[in-house]
């Protein structure tokens, strides 16, 4: 969450027993009652809020899907971190899924790159060192990758 | 009687300033969030600005630096001070009682900023 | 900021008609949506607050639905009053997000 156009810069130390609102907000952890007054918590493992706010609610904890693992899990103050499982990767324009990583190397390039769960093998032209990007090759041109990345 | 009446407005030049009324009766502000909205003529609402209860305010992007919101509790009334005005403020500004959850219940009946040379 | 998108920007209709207009809000602000009716002259009046809850002295043919990121409004028998404008604004998150209103609905006379 972005807090924007906020005014009072000082915020007070976040305290364990907070009930009322400082300077109009609430701190990480809680959000604002519908009258304004008081500062209700979050409820662990459902929802956070990481800012501070005036949001009248929690935001919803992020569920890991299937072909994800949870590298955190949600807290009243940060959401759940979920990361591809390996031998998949989570491109930058395509945030909503996990793809199975390229096995190998179009022939005639080499892998300099290995699968991460950001990013797929980066595969460069031996002569030029030229990067390739792109969909994966067809098998019979497919250069096998090392024993140590997985397999789609 | 609820109500909230504006005052204040009128003609100003470019790079002037004026500062906006708005008197209370009927309740105490001092219990409530308060906020400012602006209406260009043949336009749409705009929200200028809000203070808290606890008289933090805060400001649309465009609002900062040049508008503040403050509040007399003691005299009910709220204000809006506007520095370096331009041909775009030119507006009818609203005041109303900001209730949270429950949204903008009560409104002014506006004053009008015309900024012109 | 949120930003809310509403549509249509016009619409033009019959006395009696069924009328829905349209919010979207940029991301989730659960049930906090108040919907406002104005005239020409006049500030705007309060119709709708909590996505579908009727403020106080308003006509049971206005009625509200939605909740996340996507509303309604509907008016199921449009009355010759209701010629006017009609916005959206969020309530939650005000000073975290602002309150940036939608940018009407103007319901004219066919």
């Known amino acids: 969450i972005t807090q924007q156009d906020l005014a009072p810069q000082q915020r007070a130390a976040p305290q364990q027993k907070r009930s009322s609102p400082s300077e109009g907000l609430c701190p990480p952890g809680h959000h604002i009652s519908e009258d304004g007054r008081d500062c209700i918590s979050c409820k662990y493992g459902q929802d956070y809020s990481t800012h501070w706010n005036d949001l009248l609610f929690c935001l919803r904890c992020t569920r890991c899907d299937s072909g994800e693992v949870e590298l955190s899990p949600c807290t009243t103050t940060r959401n759940t971190v979920c990361q591809c499982e390996e031998g998949t990767f989570r491109e930058e324009d395509s945030p909503e899924m996990c793809r199975k990583c390229r096995t190998g190397c179009p022939r005639g390039m080499v892998k300099v790159g290995d699968c991460t769960p950001w990013s797929d093998i980066e595969c460069v032209h031996k002569e030029s060192g030229t990067k390739h990007s792109g969909e994966a090759p067809a098998v019979e041109e497919t250069v096998t990758s090392s024993p140590g990345t997985p397999a789609s | 009687q609820v109500q909230l009446v504006e005052s204040g407005g009128g003609l100003v030049q470019p790079g002037g300033s004026l500062r906006l009324s708005c008197s209370a009766s009927?309740?105490?502000?001092?219990?409530?969030?308060m906020i400012w909205v602006r209406q260009a003529p043949g336009k749409g609402l705009e929200y200028v600005g809000f203070i808290t209860s606890d008289s933090s305010a805060y400001y649309a992007s465009w609002a900062k630096g040049r508008f503040t919101i403050s509040r007399d509790n003691s005299k009910n009334t709220l204000y809006l001070q506007m520095n370096s005005l331009r041909a775009e403020d030119t507006a009818v500004y609203y005041c109303?009682?900001?209730?949270?959850?429950?949204?903008?219940?009560?409104w002014g009946q506006g004053t009008l900023v015309t900024v012109s040379s | 900021d949120i930003q809310m998108t509403q549509s249509p920007s016009s619409l033009s209709a019959s006395v009696g008609d069924r009328v829905t207009i349209t919010c979207r809000a940029s991301?989730?602000?659960?049930?906090?949506l108040s919907w406002y009716q104005q005239k020409p002259g006049q500030p705007p009046k309060r119709l709708i607050y909590?996505?579908?809850t009727l403020a106080s002295g308003v006509p049971s043919r206005f009625s509200g639905s939605g909740s996340g990121t996507d509303f309604t409004l509907t008016i199921s028998s449009l009355q010759p009053e209701d010629f006017a404008t009609y916005y959206c604004q969020p309530n939650s998150g005000i000073a975290t997000y602002g309150a940036a209103f939608g940018g009407g609905t103007k319901v004219e006379i066919k």
């Open positions: 991301q989730s602000i659960s049930t906090y």
């Open positions: 909590k996505a579908s």
């Open positions: 009927g309740f105490s502000i001092s219990r409530y969030a």
């Open positions: 109303a009682r900001y209730t949270y959850s429950d949204g903008t219940d009560l």
